[in-house]
Amino acid sequence: DIIMRPSCAPGWFYHKSNCYGYFRKLRNWSDAELECQSYGNGAHLASILSLKEASTIAEYISGYQRSQPIWIGLHDPQKRQQWQWIDGAMYLYRSWSGKSMGGNKHCAEMSSNNNFLTWSSNECNKRQHFLCKYRP
């Protein structure tokens, strides 16, 4: 039997059973999540669940830019430092940069300071690039 690798939507990239879309549009966190959902296929702002996944994403984004933070699907909806992935994935892998927590910052971004391998929290209303993910 020939097993075909699933195809992703045009402009999205494939890695280990998932499709990822990097958007250089400027959206606050909730608008970014709505836009991800609008692409269908069960897409959400991306969950990042391993160092391997983080490294692949970081390498891809670095091909486009190295200075702008990017929204991912991690947020603190109750504002109690109880972080969760918007797609329902288990919050096990963590990659926070040193001084990232606290204050009124309840949405997570991939930080450009460490080549997108670490996360920082930020104010959810800020307009930034974003990363979507779905399983084809």
């Epitope: 400027l26 200075s67 933070p69 009124n104 450009s112 930020n122 104010e123």
Partner: antibody, heavy 116, light 107 residues
């Protein structure tokens, strides 16, 4: 009340540099991005760049090619724009503006005149 | 960069008249557009955000509409205090870009 108070007018010689300040009050300074805009005499508005006061991350309009440097001082809730190697083309009114979810609030403007 | 083409560049209108100003983007900007009013010697003031959201405190005679590439600002019944220069701004992508402005004067 949300306010952005900019520094006063500047008269500088060609080749010099200048630092314009924008002091924010009435809101949490790190919670909103700040952008800067140039308005040459009788002309439209040009977006120079943006800074996130929370982490210092900047974005510049490539048209201005290294002319501006945006910084913040969180302790005084102040944003700065440094302009270098000034020429007569840099003579303009410069505005800072707080980027809101719904509406943007602007400073009163700083007039820069570059003349020998 | 996204180019914002604003028209007309200047216009005269009578008090009580309905006035419309348009902005056309060089690509779809997903309604991420604001309208500003600037009076002589003053800084711009936001009137409309997200193409059709009226800023608190702005008179209801101002309204915004549009989607995709085409947007407009309408003043339903012109008042004397409405004269000034109006600008659109797209904030869908970096760098943000402004329209060239529309100078509105009273006939």
């Amino acid at each position: 009340e949300i306010q952005l108070q900019q520094s006063g007018p500047e008269l500088v010689k060609p080749g010099a540099s200048v630092k314009v300040s924008c002091k924010a009050s009435g809101y949490a300074f790190t919670s909103y991005n700040m952008y800067w805009v140039k308005q040459s005499h009788g002309q439209s508005l040009e977006w120079i760049g943006r800074i996130d006061p929370h982490n210092g991350v900047t974005t510049y309009n490539q048209k201005f090619k290294g002319k501006p440097t945006l910084t913040v001082d969180r302790s005084s809730s102040t944003a700065f724009m440094h302009l270098n190697s000034l020429t007569s083309e840099d003579s303009a009114v410069y505005y800072c503006a707080r980027e809101g979810y719904d509406y943007d609030v602007w400073g009163q403007g700083t007039t820069l005149t570059v003349s020998s | 960069d996204i180019k914002m083409t604003q028209s007309p560049s200047s216009m005269y209108a009578s008090l009580g008249e309905r006035v419309s100003i348009t902005c056309k983007a060089s690509q779809d900007i997903n309604s991420f557009l604001s309208w500003f009013q600037q009076k002589p010697g003053k800084s711009p003031k936001t009137l409309i955000y997200r193409a059709n959201g009226l800023v608190d405190g702005v008179p209801s005679r101002f309204s915004g509409s549009g989607s995709g590439q085409d947007y407009s600002l309408t003043i339903s019944s012109l008042e004397y205090e409405d004269m000034g220069i109006y600008y659109c701004l797209q904030y869908d992508e970096f760098p943000y870009t402004f329209g060239g402005g529309t100078k509105l004067e009273i006939k």
